[in-house]
């Protein structure tokens, strides 16, 4: 669809005569008839196949035709067509004299014709005007013409329909050749597909408008590259959607079992050391001066027997005070005023004088200690037990009671954590300095390989009645482990017994 436009510019008929040579009375009141038709090698009369148009009286004898496209659209003349422009045409322009006001062909005498021109040729669609001038013996006509496409039609032949739009069906404008030019943020054949936020994950994200990034179920974040843990997960994360991989110190299917009570609850008071000893279980090792399960009770400061050489201890508000026996002084009765002459060494200790007899030192036999050999040796004072083992005096000897996971005389040997096969689903166990690590086979994850991760035959939840689904990774098939009271390959048939569910 398009329009052939003809712009009449000037008509010269200086003598004011008709084609017959007869003069017009009083002058030639001139109007034009235009016939547009298909290309003919020799332009002949006949139907105006592409259209026809007439003008009103435009002037008398010789006149210029002003551009009147704004006021009524009579010049340029418009010859619309509703077909593919063929690229060739024939054009007949007739100038007629109007003696009266009726310009219909049947109302005019046949000799009212002033002049007739006929042209033919090629004409491509375009914005540029072709200027032409046709001269006869008595008249001259100057005009220009062009073919342009109608609104929403494009291309060399005005055959390509394109209507710009910005709605559900497309977001585009039209290029001069009729091809679509997508509005910013849209793509696709009809510009219906939004361009998502840059970086939006191709599989996990999508968008319904440009620069958006909406996540598919199980994914989150600005670019939909972070998973969402399982609905029931409490203290865990994920690497694929709906997983529950436990944070440090938590265990169980939904990471709700507290394996690190010490860190999560800090139960030990007064600077005591906390040791985890199982789920929700712990042991507090108290600092001197404290006792109780959580080291919450303060001991009397005298309970640690701070007074030496037989001094007696008295509790005070701000500490304690030692009352020293004769011959001793100092905060803890640690200084002696005796000499070897006073036989100060007990339990067979031998006395050696120092500083010209001003004081002395006792050399104690085995199993005795103290400045006067007055104490039996406590073999546990040197903390010989490693890895938190508890030291016990046993007469002349000592022994270590080891914490779980350790053995040896001094609890110096680490019992393999892997001995109890803690890794599920065929995971490989590795002993570490302070625990173990499981390397999981394909399709499993979690601290103990307890979480199934593969997208497998069980993903479609084929098992009924709360049955547990297992995937055979070698064949990509599933097996349903039926709860009590159900049978069938998918546990779909009740066996007539009341079902029992492990709530």
């Amino acid at each position: 669809s398009g329009v052939f436009q003809l712009q009449l510019q000037e008509f010269i008929n200086e003598r004011g005569v008709l084609a017959s040579g007869r003069p017009c009375e009083p002058g030639c009141r001139t109007f034009f008839r235009v016939c547009l038709k298909h290309f003919q090698a020799v332009v002949s009369p006949g139907p105006c196949t592409f259209g026809t148009v007439s003008t009103p009286v435009l002037g008398t004898n010789s006149f210029a035709v002003r551009d009147d496209s704004s006021g009524g659209g009579r010049n340029p003349l418009q010859l619309p067509f509703n077909f593919t422009w063929p690229g060739t045409f024939s054009l007949i322009i007739e100038a007629w004299h109007a003696p009266g006001d009726d310009l219909r062909p049947e109302a005019l005498p046949p000799d009212a014709l002033i002049s007739k021109i006929a042209i033919q040729g090629s004409l491509a669609v375009g914005q540029n005007w072709l200027l032409d001038e046709q001269t006869s013996t008595l008249t001259r006509l100057r005009y220009s013409y062009r073919v342009i496409c109608s609104d929403n039609y494009y291309g060399d032949n005005c055959s390509r329909l394109c209507k710009k739009r910005n709605d559900h069906f497309g977001h585009y404008v039209c290029q001069p050749d009729g091809n679509l030019s997508c509005l910013p943020g849209w793509t696709g054949e009809y510009c219906q597909q939004p361009i998502c936020l840059s970086g939006c994950h191709e599989q996990n994200g999508y968008c319904s408008k440009p620069a958006e990034c909406l996540c598919r179920p199980g994914w989150q974040g600005r670019l939909c590259n972070e998973c969402i843990p399982h609905n029931g997960c409490r203290h865990g994360t994920c690497s694929t959607p709906w997983q529950c991989t436990c944070d440090e110190g938590w265990g169980g299917l939904f990471c709700d079992q507290d394996l690190n009570y010490c860190t999560h609850h800090s139960p030990c008071k007064n600077g005591a050391t906390c040791s985890n000893s199982g789920q929700r279980s712990y042991t507090c090792t108290c600092r001197p001066g404290y006792t109780g399960v959580d080291c919450e009770l303060e001991l009397s400061e005298c309970d640690s027997n701070p007074c030496r050489n037989g001094g007696s201890c008295k509790d005070q508000e701000d500490g304690y005070h030692c009352l020293c026996p004769p011959g001793y002084y100092g905060l803890h009765c640690e200084h002696s005023t005796l000499s070897c002459a006073d036989s100060p060494c007990f339990n067979g200790g031998s006395c050696r004088e120092r500083n010209q007899g001003a004081n002395y030192a006792c050399e104690c036999p085995p199993n005795f200690t103290g400045s006067n050999c007055e104490k039996k040796v406590d073999r546990c004072t040197s903390n010989p037990c490693a890895n938190g083992g508890q030291c016990l005096n046993r007469g002349p000897s000592r022994m270590c009671r080891c914490r779980p996971g350790f053995t040896g005389t001094y609890c110096e040997l680490h019992v393999s954590d892997c001995a109890r096969n803690p890794c599920a689903h065929g995971g490989t166990c590795h002993d570490l300095e302070n625990g173990l690590m499981c390397t999981c086979p394909a399709g499993f994850s979690g601290r103990r390989c307890e979480v199934r991760t593969s997208i497998d035959a069980c993903a479609s939840s084929p098992c009924f009645n709360r049955a547990t689904c297992y995937t055979d990774l070698s064949t990509d098939t599933f097996v349903c482990n039926c709860p009590y009271g159900f049978v069938g390959s998918r546990c779909e048939f009740p066996v007539g017994l009341p079902p029992s569910f492990p709530w």
């Epitope: 179920p217 199980g218 989150q220 974040g221 972070e226 865990g236 994360t237 944070d247």
Partner: antibody
């Protein structure tokens, strides 16, 4: 035990503001996306806003966009909803919930009533 | 936005009855559907997710089925504590949307 406790609701005039809080416990708050869901008196449930756990990305229903702001403080295990330019149609019980716009809402708080009226 | 339509809007039944509530989505939501139970003055509680998975601690008398656009919640044998309002919710498309609710009352 998972617990979500909302606070901050009350009576406010149209055009006014309120800030709702939700204190979370019993789970590692920073690991999970959170949401606000509301329920007008005698009506059904309506999702309001969501915030991711990973990077704090936020999403809102069209009717509250530009007026409401969802945020979180992982160090305090607390979720917030700042509500400005309140309208009568915002009157509802507001529930804090654990979930995203593309996952079920697994846990819910007891709700806090917001009444917008002159 | 996806419209979720529940039927019936209300339902009377007796203890021990088998009850079915349906939920229809205006377009395909695959299996991304959840069911919630809400009692007067209380918060909703997740019953079922991904169409047919029971949430932690939910009794086995509750079950879900369906896919695409048509879904069902079934209570095999009503207990006194089951009288409540039930909502379905889709989380396949943004934004998430809920059904209008089905009120289950004692006959």
């Amino acid at each position: 035990e998972v617990q979500l406790v909302e606070s901050g609701g009350g009576l406010v005039q149209p055009g006014g503001s309120l800030r709702l809080s939700c204190a979370a416990s019993g789970f590692t708050f920073s690991n999970f996306p959170m949401a606000w869901v509301r329920q007008a008196p005698g009506k059904g449930l309506e999702w309001v806003a969501t915030i991711s756990s990973s990077d704090g990305t936020t999403y809102y229903r069209d009717s509250v966009k530009g007026r409401f702001t969802i945020s979180r403080d992982n160090s305090k295990s607390t979720l917030y909803l700042q509500m400005n330019s309140l309208r009568a149609e915002d009157t509802a019980v507001y529930y804090c919930s654990r979930g995203y716009y593309n996952s079920p809402f697994a846990y819910w708080g007891q709700g806090t009533l917001v009444t917008v009226s002159s | 936005d996806i419209q979720m339509t529940q039927s019936p809007s209300s339902l009377s039944a007796s203890v021990g009855d088998r009850v079915t509530i349906t939920c229809r989505a205006s377009e395909d939501i695959y299996s991304n559907l959840a069911w919630y139970q809400q009692k007067p003055g209380k918060a909703p509680k997740l019953l079922i997710y991904d169409t047919n998975n029971l949430a932690d601690g939910v009794p086995s008398r509750f079950s879900g089925s369906g896919s695409g656009t048509d879904f069902t919640l079934t209570i095999s044998s009503l207990q006194p504590e089951d009288f409540a309002t039930y909502y379905c919710q889709q989380y396949n498309n943004y934004p998430p949307t809920f059904g209008q609710g089905t009120k289950l009352e004692i006959k």
